[in-house]
Amino acid sequence: SERCDDWGLDTMRQIQVFEDEPARIKCPLFEHFLKFNYSTAHSAGLTLIWYWTRQDRDLEEPINFRLPENRISKEKDVLWFRPTLLNDTGNYTCMLRNTTYCSKVAFPLEVVQKDSCFNSPMKLPVHKLYIEYGIQRITCPNVDGYFPSSVKPTITWYMGCYKIQNFNNVIPEGMNLSFLIALISNNGNYTCVVTYPENGRTFHLTRTLTVKVVGSPKNAVPPVIHSPNDHVVYEKEPGEELLIPCTVYFSFLMDSRNEVWWTIDGKKPDDITIDVTINESISHSRTEDETRTQILSIKKVTSEDLKRSYVCHARSAKGEVAKAAKVKQKVPAPRYTVELACGFGAT
């Protein structure tokens, strides 16, 4: 009944596990909330208590650790399911306490079903491979701690529904899957099924990830400004709308921030008084190269606006570039009644 530091429901760690498979879930307190680990807490006399709230219920209840074959157990700071059932879905709470201290956090656990081709509502991690970059590997994820190193599991790899064997450029090597030379055709979902024995029973771990083949750093270049360019002139009369697109191509670069911005007479549009709007759109190629377009628009351009300098800037991890638009005032066609008549000596 004493006060407990409640970290609430940690929805950032939405844990999804497959039905009828083992699952080991670490108490998030030690990983994300507290500055000490389980061993330190345990030796300081703190106890870790687990309980849960079933899906669509409000009632917190203790976890039943007396199920046949120890289906649910706790080991140090890990909650084990051997295996999970669909109705294990719910919010789980781990609480660390003694007579003077209490801290707890809840997290959602969702047990999901998969079909025979490994399709499921599971959110899949994405692994990016560089196109035509030489040998690259993916590793069967999140299988550590399920069996001791003395146990030699069998691992089968699938692409989509198909077992990977005699594929041209994809070779299973135990926990790793090697891509000799990654191509766009290698995009897709890859599944490893790890089978291991434990106490006379056989368990399966299914792990699916999405492979996305992206642009190689070998091909990466600084941003390329396609527009504005030297071939295009924006010739306008005062009162007309001025529309200048800045279109920039960015090579895919892992963890690079791509930026595009306009300056008018050396200032950001926000810092000047003219009525200018900028609309941005972004598209991606199949290797995740990015094209960003920022359209600068002045609804009713003035003769002053047509004398200004309009420069498009772009920056990525590969460098920074800039290009000025060629803007000029259209020379009005002569009006016969005045200009031409004067030319003919009329008064």
């Epitope: 295009v232 924006y234 529309l243 200048i244 697109p245 191509y249 598209s283 377009t293 359209i295």
Partner: antibody, heavy 123, light 112 residues
Framework: QVQLVQSGAEVKKPGASVKVSCKAS????????MNWVRQAPGQGLEWMGQ????????YYAQKFQGRVTMTRDTSTSTVYMELSSLRSEDTAVYYC????????????????WGQGTLVTVSS | DIVLTQSPISLAVFLGQRATISCRAS??????????MHWYQQKAGQPPKLLIK???DLESGVPVRFSGSGSGTDFILNIHPVEVEDIATYYC??????????FGGGTKLEIK
């Protein structure tokens, strides 16, 4: 998805003019060059010129200079190609084709094409 | 103007075999880092379709049996293995500098 839809077939007399339209959708119209390419029956492809819709800037192949005019209407995302002083050898399928953007600063390819408009010049 | 010469004018190959089409430019269409040479496929009664851009980069959705190579003035389109749906006319195209684009004369591919 990107689509270029051209106007229907035309039959014209020698000396007349023809105006073919190409309506674009599925992308930001003003930011891509639009080209016109023609193909006489049983012949190869011939580039006629291009227009940049944002500014109306045009470039024409020397062969068509003075006879071709390319315009655009940004409110309807449509480009037009008008060819005047038609002669029988102008009988061809006329295609509009969009220039793509890539990691290189020039030397562009034509990534999307209209379905083509047959123009027949006959007395 | 740069002139593109394609050879052969027509080509007949067995299904599953390799088809090689060549395109020679009257002057170089390469600069540091890239070549402005592209390849298109045109089937009867259809508009051309971009296959390969910048000499060797496969366009999205194009089968990997198509490949391109070359630089400077000499370029090659390879199709291997040839399939029935590859029956078409193939054009090379250069876009060296605005505003002049030209196409090769075309190569008609047939099945033996």
């Amino acid at each position: 998805q990107v689509q270029l839809v051209q106007s229907g077939a035309e039959v014209k007399k020698p000396g007349a003019s023809v105006k073919v339209s190409c309506k674009a959708s599925g992308y930001i119209f003003i930011t891509y060059w639009m080209n016109w390419v023609r193909q006489a029956p049983g012949q190869g492809l011939e580039w006629m010129g291009q227009i940049f819709p944002a500014s109306g800037t045009t470039y024409y192949a020397q062969k068509f200079q003075g006879r071709v005019t390319m315009t655009r209407d940004t409110s309807t995302s449509t480009v037009y190609m008008e060819l005047s002083s038609l002669r029988s050898e102008d009988t061809a399928v006329y295609y509009c084709a969009r220039t793509d953007f890539y990691r290189y600063d020039g030397g562009y390819a034509l990534d999307y094409w209209g379905q083509g408009t047959l123009v027949t010049v006959s007395s | 103007d740069i002139v593109l010469t394609q050879s052969p004018i027509s080509l007949a190959v067995f299904l599953g075999q390799r088809a090689t089409i060549s395109c020679r430019a009257s002057q170089s269409v390469s600069t540091s880092g890239y070549s402005s040479m592209h390849w298109y496929q045109q089937k009867a009664g259809q508009p051309p379709k971009l296959l390969i851009k910048y000499a060797s980069d496969l366009e999205s959705g194009v089968p990997v049996r198509f490949s391109g190579s070359g630089s400077g003035t000499d370029f090659i389109l390879n199709i291997h293995p040839v399939e029935v749906e590859d029956i078409a006319t193939y054009y090379c195209h250069h876009s060296w500098g605005i505003p002049m684009y030209t196409f090769g004369g075309g190569t008609k591919l047939e099945i033996k």
